[in-house]
């Protein structure tokens, strides 16, 4: 037999919490245990679920937990059946609700010494206890005209006078909880001598000059009295309007005119109306004045055929927000199409040549109107006027490749050298039509030249192969003057290019031959042993057949290079004593003597009183200081040849004998004594 | 309150000239396309020219191209119409009137005759 | 150049009626609409603009409705005062154009 050792029970349940009805069985075989509710199977969910043979309910719902439960085993074996005891739950909740009105049926009925019920919509088991409040204050029972009837819910206003007034909730409580009114109930029992609105002031907006109007009307038993203030609590009265508001007119109506607006008038201006009793209600309107700012300018556009764009037009500030719209041609667009005006931005889809124009973006309010145009350009790809040509140029003189291409907008030519960028410089410009100049064509421009012309819509490109026609010259030019060592060996070279190798021959100007001991070999000049005899003129020529002959005269010294005959010494000087640099040259033409000085040259015409240079070409340094101190060159130098050699001058502290020491005792080193 | 003042009318005999003001005030005038409007005697009315605020764009009808001016200064606050080579089907009231998206101030006008 | 044509030319109401006007365009003009009202011997006076909105101080039983070519002017409860003539007019593109008028007469 199937026994219940743990029976199910009623019970106390919370709404919403946890419970479990307990089932434990026993029997001798296998048994299926499954719960009836008011005797139908109940199937599993997330909220109630069997936990072993009992049941369990993650949330108690007042609703769907309400009934009659039993927990029923079986054994399939023999189909044995035993049923537990019912049980059920006592579920305590509280729900919140509104407060409505029940009598009278409509709040249009709602008359002052009319009866006013209000029922408050919390329920709940146990069925909780209600208190009632007027704007947020608690009402107690049998306090000043009215009645609350707990069990009914509901507060009766019995009559309901103007001190009714007020924003009624209620709140209740149970043994489960608390809950106050979902949605608050408005009672408003006009006293027909308090002012009400009739018609309200609106807030208005108008342009400088014009003129402004706002409404105000109030009523009440006897009428009310009506003010109109501005902003600083100026009132305003036909009698007596403040400065500023000269041209403000107040009608009987209750209505105020202003005319001729301007900046200073704008603001708010308050409506106050005053019943007989109760308070003044003041309405508030406020004045704007419309004004309407400058448009951005728009940058041209260049858009490129088959595309969409669009373009936004910004609306200036203004006051009311400004209205746009867009126009092309004295046509405003429209709002769908090819072309057309989305919100505020023009759009081109599928853009044609033929879009390309000026449009206009228009913008207006109440206080004015503000356009901008921009220009739009429809890019097309370039096409060839005239292409660059494989061309012969002709060295140091100027050369030009062109690279004419039409398009829109003008297009942009660039050029590559051997596919190097050209960037302008003092050799290469293009000009604004393309066309490429080298200034001074050198023989390593021969080389491929690309031109591209481009526009947002595409670019074309050719090229070209530029042949240097090479001049004849000489390579490099022999110098002008040169010098020769007197009874030495000396060669004088001359070499020159075209475009066929030149022949080079050696002759003195003044037509003379050229003595044995000299020979003039593929174009170097040789001297065997020269002699004074050997100074002169001379000139290189150098010639082919198609470009002819060249000339670079040369004028020959023969000169005795330069030897010191003395040189400066190392030099050890006292403070305040005198220096002797010596420094002779010799050599033809005979040399000039220049000194140097810490690292600048002294100019004898700027040495002052304490330095001079002699004829001979020694430095005297009087009255040394330590910065006197340092290197000093002598640099010989004639039209032939430069040396240069050095020494040190030291500047030292004289010292102070010792007492040992005689009076002529010689320095420890070797000092110019003066 | 805005108020736009037409004068200049008159009597004018064909192919003569003759030059209309509209003298503008209680409105800030730069800042307003202004129109030509007119109306034949006993006819509809007919839009003659339009100027913008600036006036740097002014369009007209074709039956008054080449033959009318439309212009304004700002600093007088004036409108003007110089008509050119008149005819006696440009006897009309010539009214000035004031845009901001579509005309919403007119003038009084003023009635130009053209008779020999 | 865009035709605007009215009709009816002219109607007869009395006092209280609702009245309709219509305008049609010859090619779409969005909503770029204006409607004005001209009495004898006066200049016209604003009505409606954008094919729909009230001029500053016009009376609220004045409106106007449409968009592209057909429009209209709707008077919803005739007042003496309302005795006009009424023009529509484009303002979609140049030449602006109006229409020939409809005169409203008392019946």
């Known amino acids: 037999a199937i026994v219940f050792i743990k029976q199910p029970s009623s019970q106390d349940a919370l709404q919403g919490r946890r419970a479990l009805l307990r089932c434990e069985v026993e029997a001798p075989g296998p048994v299926h245990v499954y719960w009836l509710l008011d005797g139908a199977p109940v199937q599993d969910t997330e909220r109630r679920f069997a936990q072993g043979s009992s049941l369990s309910f993650a949330a108690v719902d007042r609703l769907q937990d309400s009934g009659t439960f039993q927990c029923v085993a079986r054994d399939d074996v023999t189909g044995e059946e035993a049923r537990s005891a019912n049980a059920s739950f006592n579920i305590k909740w509280i729900e919140a609700g509104p407060v409505v009105l029940k009598h009278p049926a409509s709040e249009a009925e709602i008359q002052p010494q009319t009866q006013v019920t209000l029922r408050c919509h919390i329920d709940g088991h146990p069925r909780p206890t209600y208190q009632w409040f007027r704007d947020g204050t608690p009402l107690s029972d049998g306090q000043s005209n009215h009645t609350v009837s707990s069990k009914e819910r509901n507060l009766t206003l019995r009559p309901a006078g103007p001190e009714h007034s007020g924003l009624y909730s209620c709140c209740a409580h149970s043994a489960f909880g608390q809950a106050c009114s979902s949605q608050n109930f408005t009672l408003s029992i006009a006293d027909e001598s308090f002012a009400r609105v009739v018609l309200a002031p609106q807030d208005v907006v108008v342009a400088r000059y014009e003129e402004a109007m706002f409404h105000c009307q109030f009523s009440a038993q006897p009428p009310p009295s009506l003010q109109w203030l501005f902003e600083d609590e100026t009132p305003i009265t036909n009698r007596s309007r403040p400065p500023h508001l000269r041209r403000a007119t107040v009608f009987a109506n209750g209505s105020l005119l202003l005319t001729q607006v301007r900046p200073r008038n704008a603001g708010i201006y308050r409506c106050i109306g005053q019943g007989q009793r109760g308070p003044p209600i003041i309405l508030e309107a406020t004045l704007h004045l419309a004004e309407i700012e400058d448009m951005p300018l728009f940058e041209p556009r260049v858009f490129t055929a088959g595309s969409e764009e669009r373009v936004t037009c910004l609306p200036p500030k203004g006051l009311p927000e400004p209205s746009v719209w867009w126009e092309h041609a004295g046509v405003r667009l429209p709002t769908h199409g090819r072309v057309y005006q989305k919100g505020h931005e023009l759009v081109l889809a599928n853009i044609a040549e033929s879009d390309a124009g000026v449009y206009t973006c228009h913008a207006a309010n109440l206080a004015g109107q503000r356009r901008q145009d921009v220009n739009i350009t429809v890019a097309t790809v370039p096409s060839w006027l005239k292409k660059p040509q494989d061309s012969q140029l002709e060295e140091g003189k100027p050369g030009y490749l062109d690279c004419l291409t039409q398009a829109t907008p003008k297009p942009t030519v660039v050029w590559y050298r051997n596919q190097m960028l050209i960037s302008e410089d003092s050799r290469f410009e293009v000009f604004k039509n393309g066309t490429l100049r080298i200034n001074s064509v050198e023989v390593y421009d021969g080389t491929w030249y690309r031109c591209m012309s481009s526009t947002p819509a595409g670019s074309i490109e050719a090229q070209a192969r530029v042949q240097v026609l090479e001049k004849l010259k000489f390579t490099p030019p022999p110098q002008p003057q040169q010098c020769m060592e007197f009874d030495k060996e000396a060669t004088v070279p001359c070499s020159a290019t075209g475009r066929e190798k030149p022949t080079i021959k050696w002759e003195r100007a003044d037509g003379s031959s050229l003595p044995e001991w000299v020979t003039d070999n593929a174009g170097t000049l040789h001297f065997a042993r020269v002699t004074r005899d050997d100074a002169g003129n001379y000139t290189c020529i150098a010639s082919n057949g198609p470009q002819g002959q060249i000339r670079a005269h040369v004028q020959l010294t023969v000169a005795v290079f330069i030897t010191f005959k003395v040189e400066p010494e190392r030099t050890t000087v006292y403070q305040g004593h005198t220096a002797l640099l010596q420094c002779e040259a010799q050599g033809d033409p005979k040399p000039l003597i220049q000194w140097k000085g810490k690292d600048r040259i002294l100019d004898p015409t700027k040495l002052g009183p304490r330095m001079h240079i002699f004829q001979n070409g020694s430095l005297v340094i009087h009255d040394v200081a330590p910065e006197d101190s340092g290197r000093y060159t002598c640099i010989a130098g004639n039209s032939c040849n430069i040396k240069h050699t050095e020494a040190p001058l030291y500047v030292v502290d004289k010292p102070v004998p010792e007492e040992s020491e005689g009076p002529g005792s010689p320095p420890p080193y070797k000092m110019i004594q003066t | 309150q805005v108020q736009l003042v037409e004068s200049g009318g008159g009597v004018v005999q064909p192919g003569r000239s003759l030059r209309l003001s509209c003298a503008a005030s209680g409105f800030i005038f730069s800042n307003y396309a202004m129109h030509w409007v007119r109306q034949a005697p006993g006819k509809g009315l007919e839009w003659v020219a339009v100027?913008?605020?600036?006036?740097?764009?002014?369009y007209y009808a074709d039956s008054v191209k080449g033959r009318f001016t439309i212009s304004r200064d700002n600093s007088k606050n004036t409108l003007y119409l110089q008509m050119n080579s008149l005819r006696a089907e440009d006897t009309a009231v010539y009214y000035c009137a004031r845009e901001v998206w579509s005309i919403d101030n007119w003038g009084q006008g003023t009635l130009v005759t053209v008779s020999s | 150049d865009i035709q605007m044509t009215q009709s009816p030319s002219s109607l007869s109401a009395s006092v209280g009626d609702r009245v309709t006007i219509t305008c049609r365009a010859s090619q779409g003009i969005s909503s770029w609409l204006a409607w004005y009202q001209q009495k004898p011997e006066k200049a016209p006076k604003s009505l409606i603009y954008a094919a729909s909105s009230l001029q500053s101080g016009v009376p609220s039983r004045f409106s106007g409705s449409g968009s592209g070519t057909d429009f209209t002017l709707t008077i919803s409860s005739l007042q003496p005062e309302d005795f006009a003539t009424y023009y529509c007019q484009q303002y979609n593109s140049y030449p602006r154009t109006f229409g020939q008028g409809t005169k409203v007469e008392i019946k």
């Open positions: 100027i913008s605020y600036d006036g740097n764009n002014k």
